[in-house]
């Protein structure tokens, strides 16, 4: 782990810089200028598979270093290597409370492995609450609950997500941090597996207690649209889902776990360089208002409902899909106005075993997965050792082990 | 036109102090992160200061860190460089610079000489 | 910080010669790569940004190339007005360092 970047700065840590990037990265940006660009000159960032694609800020010239996108659940700001912003997020491990840091052994010393940890906060992912994260080599968090064997399909947090392997160097090394209001995972000096003459990789991601999200990359030795997918898949951005049951054709008394993923963020590619970052600022969600009122009542760009029954505020798109849909919510819901549930007790209800969870907003707005049927897209494997087995809770070089695997 | 004009140089004995400043116009001087640039008789231009468009951010050069405050005034369009505990190395021409929207410095002034002898 | 060494430090051409300035820098500064050309007396101008991106104003035989450490400006056919020296800045992290300077004269 070397030092910080870009020693010398004179900011206080955390300031916002409001800038277009490198040289520019002193000047006012473009969206508070708003003369400055043009619709012509627009051009797409990423994709947002929950509401399409979505224009962004750019000058005319294309070079903008600092680059804002809206994506419904999150904004992200993604700042060029020149921007010195970039260098205030990233997150000095090696300068960190040894007590916080732990050098992730295990991960350090395999490929395709991935291992849970218990956060010391409840991190806001898409405005849920979640306790556990899965580290894997693969330069990717995973942030689902059930493991699977397609832990890069969707809910993660991807930096970089690629094919790494760790084992390949006693210099490389999977470590995370954790000082209580921000959890960070870095990827130090990875290489690629059958790419490793190209150089190692440095990177990290942060996940922040106020639910932000950051990527920051230090060494990026290629250029990442060259890297190769047909192992491993490539990606970088956020992804979640939710899960639903439905009947098993084969089986009628079984159910059949499906994955939908409602949405995904998708950075360029070739926007990750050697010293950028990528900041995901979370957008307010319906499962934020814990009153009917602040739920109807809510001017977000989601159309929020409130259940009664559940008592939760929702879009319909969320992790809880399947309560929202077993107990009737989305009929519920329908033309009703607060006033209408005064006197419901919503202790009583149970799921409506009758309804569908295939309702028609569901196929044409989401990507399904399915779990059972699709062709396994990566192998990664689960470490059952989340605690001190696997872990060294020093900055002292790795020391080589046999890894568990345990097969999902 | 767009255009920087430096004033407040001159002759200084070494340790004391310096004001210089560089009148903008032309442009949005509030839209803009300012440089100072300097560059020693005979010698090659050496980067000294930047401060964000806002004037809340600043970044020095190792050899004038402590001793120089980059500093504007957005309502007057004017940018600032005060300079303490000066030295003889300090001596130089002194230009700002407009940080460009592409990329670089894309407006000069014509420089103002300050120069440190006892 | 990032040093940014140029080469040659001077040469001589001759009115119409393609003249090639190189400049490198200490670690990868990806594009981020300025070119100015400055004449006695006077504030240096900006040519190149970006690398390769031609200032406004900046007359057509001036370009530039390359990305990551190794950078160069070339002058298709020098003009008398060329003769200067050029200077080669990073743009990629603060301090903006400059190259030396190549100082370009006549044969």
């Known amino acids: 782990l070397s030092p910080q970047p870009g020693a010398g700065h004179d900011e206080g840590p955390g300031s916002g810089w409001a800038a277009k990037g490198t040289v520019r990265g002193w000047n006012r940006r473009a969206r508070e200028s708003p003369g400055h660009v043009s619709e012509p000159d627009r051009t797409q960032l990423s994709q947002d598979l929950g509401g399409g694609t979505l224009a962004m800020d750019t000058l005319p010239d294309n070079r903008t270093r600092v680059v804002e996108d809206n994506h419904s659940y999150y904004v992200s700001r993604l700042y060029g290597p020149s921007e010195p912003h970039s260098r205030e997020l990233w997150v000095d491990v090696a300068e960190a409370n040894r007590s916080q840091v732990k050098i992730h052994t295990i991960l350090s010393n395999t490929h395709r492995q991935a291992s849970r940890v218990v956060l010391s906060f409840d991190f806001p992912f898409y405005g849920h609450p979640l306790r556990q994260i899965t580290i894997a080599t693969g330069g990717f968090i995973f942030m689902g609950d059930v493991i699977h064997r397609m832990l890069t399909a969707t809910q993660y947090v991807a930096p970089l997500m690629a094919n790494f392997n760790p084992g390949y160097s006693d210099n490389s090394t999977v470590v995370y941090f954790d000082n209580g209001t921000v959890f960070v995972v870095q990827w130090d000096h990875v290489y690629l597996q059958g790419w490793e003459d190209k150089g190692s990789f440095t990177f990290q991601a942060a996940l922040h207690h106020d639910g932000r999200i950051v990527f920051a990359y230090k060494e990026i030795p290629m250029s990442v649209p060259e890297i190769s997918s047909s192992q491993h898949p490539v990606k970088t951005g956020l992804s979640d889902a939710f899960m639903i049951l439905n009947p098993s054709p084969d089986v009628p008394e079984s159910r059949r776990r499906s994955i939908f993923e409602y949405h995904r963020i998708e950075l360029d590619p070739s926007k990750v360089t050697s010293m950028s970052a990528v900041e995901f600022t979370p957008l307010p969600t319906c499962l934020q208002h814990r009153s009917c009122d602040a739920c109807m009542s809510s001017d977000l760009t989601f159309n929020c409902s409130w259940c009664h029954v559940l008592q939760r505020c929702s879009s319909g798109f969320d992790r809880y899909r399947q309560e929202w849909m077993d107990y009737g919510c989305a009929q519920e819901a329908e033309g009703r106005m607060c006033e209408d549930f005064q006197d419901e007790d919503h202790d009583s209800a149970s799921p409506d075993t009758s309804f569908s969870p295939y309702d028609g907003d569901l196929t044409t707005t989401s990507s399904s997965l399915f779990i059972d049927s699709l062709t396994t897209e990566d192998d990664t494997k689960l470490n059952p050792y989340a605690g001190g087995d696997g872990l060294q809770n020093n900055l002292s070089p790795k020391t080589k082990g046999t890894p568990v695997h345990l097969g999902t | 036109q767009v255009q920087l004009v430096e004033s407040g140089g001159g002759v200084v004995q070494p340790g004391r102090s310096l004001r210089l400043s560089c009148a903008a116009s032309g442009f949005i001087f509030s839209d803009y992160g300012m440089h100072w640039v300097r560059q020693a008789p005979g010698k090659g231009l050496e980067w000294v200061a930047v401060?964000?468009?806002?004037?809340?951010?600043?970044y020095y050069a190792d050899s004038v860190k402590g001793r120089f405050t980059i500093s504007r005034d957005n309502s007057k369009n004017t940018l600032y460089l005060q300079m303490n505990s000066l030295r003889a190395e300090d001596t130089a021409v002194y230009y700002c610079?407009?940080?460009?929207?592409?990329?670089?410095?894309?407006?000069w002034g014509q420089g103002t000489l300050v120069t440190v002898s006892s | 910080d990032i040093q940014m060494t140029q080469s040659p430090s001077s040469l001589s051409a001759s009115v119409g010669d393609r003249v090639t300035i190189t400049c490198r820098a200490s670690?990868?500064?990806?594009?981020?790569l300025n070119w100015y050309q400055q004449k006695p007396g006077k504030a240096p101008k900006l040519l190149i940004y970006?690398?390769?991106s031609l200032q406004s104003g900046v007359p057509s035989r001036f370009s530039g190339s390359g990305s990551g450490t190794d950078f160069t400006l070339t002058i298709s056919s020098l003009q008398p007005e060329d003769f200067a020296t050029y200077y080669c800045?990073?743009?990629?992290?603060?301090?903006?360092?400059f190259g030396q300077g190549t100082k370009v004269e006549i044969k």
């Open positions: 401060i964000s468009y806002e004037g809340s951010r600043e």
């Open positions: 670690q990868t500064i990806s594009n981020y």
């Open positions: 970006a690398a390769s």
């Open positions: 800045q990073q743009s990629y992290s603060p301090p903006y360092t």
């Open positions: 610079a407009r940080g460009s929207e592409g990329d670089g410095f894309d407006v």
